[in-house]
Interface confidence: low
């Protein structure tokens, strides 16, 4: 299958914006983001804006992707206690409307 130079250039540019530890499979498939390694550092909940779970069978491992307040995305291991605590905290924040 031929790929035009413009498309190839576009793909290369897009690749530079994929966060560290994250990868996206071939665009022919449905877009899925996977984590291939986890942060080995606890992230303070004060710095977190949101999270999403990665459970797709297309990915090598289950993961949580935290988005920080400055839009940086970080892969974390959902089996670690601090990750569970952080998800709980963000869930509570979402449930409690700010007055």
């Amino acid at each position: 299958m031929k790929v035009s130079a413009a498309l190839l250039c576009l793909l290369l540019i897009a690749a530079t914006f994929i966060p560290q530890g994250l990868a996206q499979p071939d665009a022919i498939n449905a877009p899925v983001t996977c984590c291939y390694n986890f942060t080995n550092r606890k992230i303070s909940v004060q710095r977190l804006a949101s999270y999403r779970r990665i459970t797709s069978s297309k990915c090598p491992k289950e993961a949580v992707i935290f988005k920080t307040i400055v839009a940086k995305e970080i892969c974390a291991d959902p089996k670690q206690k601090w990750v569970q605590d952080s998800m709980d905290h963000l869930d509570k924040q979402t449930q409690t409307p700010k007055t």
């Epitope: 550092r41 606890k42 992230i43 303070s44 909940v45 004060q46 710095r47 920080t68 400055v70 940086k72 970080i74 206690k81 601090w82 605590d85 905290h89």
Partner: antibody, heavy 116, light 111 residues
Framework: QSGGGVVQPGRSLRLSCAAS????????MHWVRQAPGKGLEWVAV????????YYADSVKGRFTISRDTSKNTLYLQMNSLRAEDTAVYYC??????????????WGQGTTVTVSS | NFMLTQPHSVSESPGKTVTISCTRS????????VQWFQQRPGSSPTTVIY?????PSGVPDRFCGSIDSSSNSASLTISGLRTEDEADYYC??????????FGGGTKLTVL
């Protein structure tokens, strides 16, 4: 750091902390105090952009933390001062990691004495 | 808010090893990073350990930080004690309400 001194209970005082040697607008900043012969007590934090401010319960509603990026200066406006506010006040730079709150650079401290 | 509890004072002879504990009253010690500060008399605090067990550049490897989930505490261990290590040591962490928490401080005397 400047602005410390002797003040009567109920009065106000404003502390200043002039920062240099780093990009002030990129870092969160804290105020931490230490009463005579006592331990360190966190007072307040302001985030790098000035949009988020948090206070210890003991000063909430009386103290206001602020910053002026154009002057590279951190402030602590202290109102309704009490005898128990007597302490050395330190400004401290936040580590400003994504990962935790901590202090990595400290000012030399300024003394506030609240006494009638 | 949780509290961080430290021994009021510890003492040891030069050349020996001393450990200062910092116990978290509620919540997991492993959920948030712990920092350790040294404060010599009449001086501002300086960081000796950050992120549980990391040493800033310039801090000798005689200073070692760790956390122990079973006792829900952090520890600062100083080996090969020197007279200049005599100071107050404070642990510090933070909670999910954007509050910073300090331990009460431990006075280290090098006999």
């Amino acid at each position: 750091q400047s602005g410390g001194g002797v003040v009567q209970p109920g009065r106000s005082l404003r502390l200043s902390c002039a920062a240099s040697g780093f990009t002030f607008s990129s870092y969160g900043m804290h105020w931490v105090r230490q009463a005579p012969g006592k331990g360190l007590e966190w007072v307040a934090v302001i985030w790098y952009d000035g949009n988020n401010k948090y206070y210890a319960d003991s000063v909430k509603g009386r103290f206001t933390i602020s910053r002026d990026t154009s002057k590279n200066t951190l402030y602590l406006q202290m109102n309704s001062l009490r005898a128990e506010d007597t302490a050395v006040y330190y400004c401290a730079r936040d580590s400003s990691s994504y990962y935790y709150y901590g202090m990595d650079v400290w000012g030399q401290g300024t003394t506030v004495t609240v006494s009638s | 808010n949780f509290m961080l509890t430290q021994p009021h004072s510890v003492s040891e002879s030069p050349g020996k090893t001393v450990t200062i504990s910092c116990t978290r009253s509620s919540g997991s010690i492993a959920s948030n990073y712990v920092q350790w500060f040294q404060q010599r008399p009449g001086s501002s605090p300086t960081t000796v350990i950050y992120e549980d067990d990391q040493r800033p550049s310039g801090v000798p490897d005689r200073f070692c930080g760790s956390i122990d989930s079973s006792s829900n505490s952090a520890s600062l261990t100083i080996s090969g004690l020197r007279t200049e290590d005599e100071a107050d040591y404070y642990c510090q962490s933070y909670d999910s309400s954007n509050h910073v928490v300090f331990g009460g401080g431990t006075k280290l005397t090098v006999l």
